[in-house]
């Protein structure tokens, strides 16, 4: 008789999840010499231990602590780029501006980026059929708790001027329910962080509005100011030109506003 399996609303674990995590860890330790002390099998064991045999709606930050410890990494605290709903451009930016880091440029963020995973209570199986959806099933699922944990730690580590890239094409440019709005904003440390600088990325070619005046940006400014952190905002009217100018800052067309 086949064992009854919980059917969740979200997609199941990414296929070849264990192999993918291990391979990403190997690649990361090759690319980042300062992380060559990391044992990738220990990392996978700790990752697995966070969710295997546990109810996928009952995961805690504590479950991820062994993995957090193994993935401890020092990034320059004044070179942190946060993002919300505009991951691809943020990653393109840090690939060019090599001294700046998104969460996905760190080992733990790199390991889990774009992956889904969950287990089942009391079995050592990985559930490849379905995993809990944050809205429809539960918020304390393995993926959500992982990102909440690493995002909190990443924001806590930030200092000086912290940058955030926001998507100006969204109805809510700043969304209080995003990871940035619900976790990172509230874990920036006022005693270390002087300024949060928002870069609002425009979508339309002819969009010349000042999106820094958007009500949601004003809401962000209010939250940040109440936390005794200064706030500044810049419009990035031409993201393609913006990236090009990061690559070639000497280009004569890069002196004008982008």
């Amino acid at each position: 008789v086949p064992r009854w399996r919980q059917q969740w609303s979200g997609p199941g674990t990414t296929k070849r999840f264990p192999e993918t995590v291990l391979a990403r860890c190997v690649k990361y330790t090759e690319i980042h010499p300062e992380m060559r002390h990391v044992d990738c099998q220990s990392v996978w064991d700790a990752f697995k231990g966070a969710f295997i045999s546990k109810h996928p709606c009952n995961i805690t930050e504590e479950d991820y602590q062994p993995l957090m410890k193994l993935g401890t990494q020092t990034v320059p605290c004044n070179k942190i780029l946060l993002w919300s709903r505009i991951k691809d451009l943020a990653h393109q930016f840090t690939q060019v501006q090599r001294d700046m880091f998104t969460l996905e440029d760190t080992l733990l963020g790199y390991l889990a980026d774009d992956l889904t995973w969950c287990g089942e209570f009391n079995t050592s199986k990985i559930n490849y059929q379905s995993c809990p959806d944050w809205r429809k099933d539960c918020s304390n699922n393995p993926v959500s708790v992982f990102w909440k944990t690493v995002s909190r730690r990443f924001a806590e580590a930030a200092c000086d001027v912290v940058h955030v890239m926001l998507n100006g094409s969204r109805s809510k440019i700043f969304d209080k329910n995003s990871t940035f709005g619900s976790v990172e904003v509230h874990n920036l440390q006022p005693e270390k962080v002087q300024t949060l600088e928002a870069w609002v990325i425009h979508g339309g070619r002819e969009d010349s509005r000042d999106l820094c005046q958007d009500p949601t940006i004003k809401e962000l400014e209010s939250i940040i100011s109440k936390r005794n952190i200064q706030f500044s905002c810049k419009n990035i009217y031409r993201p393609d030109k913006f990236l090009q100018c990061v690559k070639n800052p000497e280009d004569s067309s890069c002196t004008s506003e982008i």
Partner: antibody, heavy 120, light 112 residues
Amino acid sequence: QVQLVQSGAEVKKPGASVKVSCKASGYSFTNYAVHWVRQAPGQGLEWMGVISPYYGDTTYAQKFQGRVTMTVDKSSSTAYMELSRLRSDDTAVYYCARRFEGFYYSMDYWGQGTLVTVSS
Amino acid sequence: DVVMTQSPLSLPVTLGQPASISCRPSQSLVHSNGNTYLNWYQQRPGQSPKLLIYKVSKRFSGVPDRFSGSGSGTDFTLKISRVEAEDVGVYYCSQSTHVPLTFGGGTKVEIK
């Protein structure tokens, strides 16, 4: 499956240089460092150094510093080890070995070895 | 450099009988990441070395379960529970905790 295929045997004169190749297949070459280890006739194993193909950065054993050069050609998934100013005690079988998945400084799969004979 | 002292040098064994090889590093092999990188390699006659055991006691994929590793501190052991004809060769311990990586002198396992 993971395979490391090395170049053929070489006979060299003292003072000359030798360059041994190691062609990798069955895995993503740039993601795994390549170690070089040698074994003198009837002797044990001696680690020479390691190269990371992604950036080409190297770590050499102190003993070989200044005489060994490890390089890679990413386009052909090949690692090279060149040893200069050869002496008769450099006569050995030279092995390349892939870094172990778990840890940068461990090795899992090895090439078949290349015998280098240094003789006048 | 870490000196790896292996014993015995030669080990004549009867087929089906157990065999045990000792390895003593000159210093602790506990890495700053908490792992102990003590490995065992098998080199059959005319072949290149093959990884048997890594991190003291973990068997590499495809290695028969008659091979086991144990130990801690500066005292490590490789055991073959029942020696088979294909186990003939030289066994090396190695450490990859400290650079340069170093190997033991080898133990030759032969059939009596």
